[in-house]
Amino acid sequence: VKVLHEPSCFSDYISTSVCQWKMDHPTNCSAELRLSYQLDFMGSENHTCVPENREDSVCVCSMPIDDAVEADVYQLDLWAGQQLLWSGSFQPSKHVKPRTPGNLTVHPNISHTWLLMWTNPYPTENHLHSELTYMVNVSNDNDPEDFKVYNVTYMGPTLRLAASTLKSGASYSARVRAWAQTYNSTWSDWSPSTTWLNYYEP
């Protein structure tokens, strides 16, 4: 039993870290493997994560990790029975993948504008709540060439969109994702799309 691509881990920096790795052959991850993780502190609890299959030879483990702070480092050990396959460390604050923004909605607004709104996925007391910036992708459902990308770098999960910038009578979809600049995070997954009809008449 060998690891082909060693674990790559990301944290949402509030409750969960996810590690993914690839084995050198198709593997029943939950039956054959265990990922143990422990905060790198004398006297910290040792936890075990049971991985699941993402593909035949790709395993993924979701680890509850609470109360993350910047200095926290976890020791990770991947086991196949009594055999240690891989050992490494993981610092959640250095590998942040924000949670996905939620509840994306589109509302008609004054002066021929659309108001796109979504929810910040973090509670106000979490470090990331005030750190997120967003990318909004707006695309014409019937014309793949007609799409726009908006960077929302101000506080507040909203975007005002002039209806005149979109084709009249066309159906549009929007989706949003987040990143945390100060944590040099990766982008979150895209939110589910929301669709509306642009009925603006010039």
């Epitope: 905060l39 502190f41 004398m42 006297g43 910290s44 609890e45 040792n46 936890h47 509850p64 609470d66 109360d67 926290d72």
Partner: antibody, heavy 117, light 107 residues
Framework: QVQLKESGPGLVAPSQSLSITCTVS????????VHWVRQPPGKGLEWLGM???????DYNSVFKSRLSISKDNSKSQVFLKMNSLQTDDTAMYYC???????????WGQGTSVTVSS | DIQMTQTTSSLSASLGDRVTISCRAS??????LNWYQQKPDGTVKLLIY???RLQSGVPSRFSGSGSGTDYCLTISNLEQEDIATYFC?????????FGSGTKLELK
Amino acid sequence: QVQLKESGPGLVAPSQSLSITCTVSGFSLSRYSVHWVRQPPGKGLEWLGMIWGGGSTDYNSVFKSRLSISKDNSKSQVFLKMNSLQTDDTAMYYCARTYRGYALDYWGQGTSVTVSS
Amino acid sequence: DIQMTQTTSSLSASLGDRVTISCRASQDISNYLNWYQQKPDGTVKLLIYYTSRLQSGVPSRFSGSGSGTDYCLTISNLEQEDIATYFCQQANTLPLTFGSGTKLELK
């Protein structure tokens, strides 16, 4: 939010046993260790023992022969039982949680135990 | 067992003062030193863990330093709500042991 609350008898007769329950909320006992600490009137803090998330226990050797710590994860309760109490066991008894090593990051408000006839 | 010594049992200071409380371990504890605040009503709160890491929600006027066997807690600008007893605790080995406490009073 994280909370711990001790409940005990208040008064215990000498040579009798003490039972205290620590009821927790806001976290899972299967993932966190819980410690017991006591403080005699006007004195410092004294560590009694702990129970790990996995259920194993560690005790202060001073109390090991008469101390037992157990828990019920499903009820979110940790139990302390101490036998053969004497008057110098009179103290405020605290339960506390740890996450980052042995740093006790959340404490109960304590329950006062008096050993007297 | 590791003995923890807080030589100053009580300390008087004025509001706005910079206050330093010291703690000594009987052997090297590799920075596994925590500080707690106990209010007069008995409430206990973790302030600093691993010598210098500020516990979430604790004001930044609290700081910790030290290494080996000697450690300090500093309150940079004393406020009324800081009037309490402060305990150090070694977290290097079981059994966990605490200092005897330093009671902070107002001048």
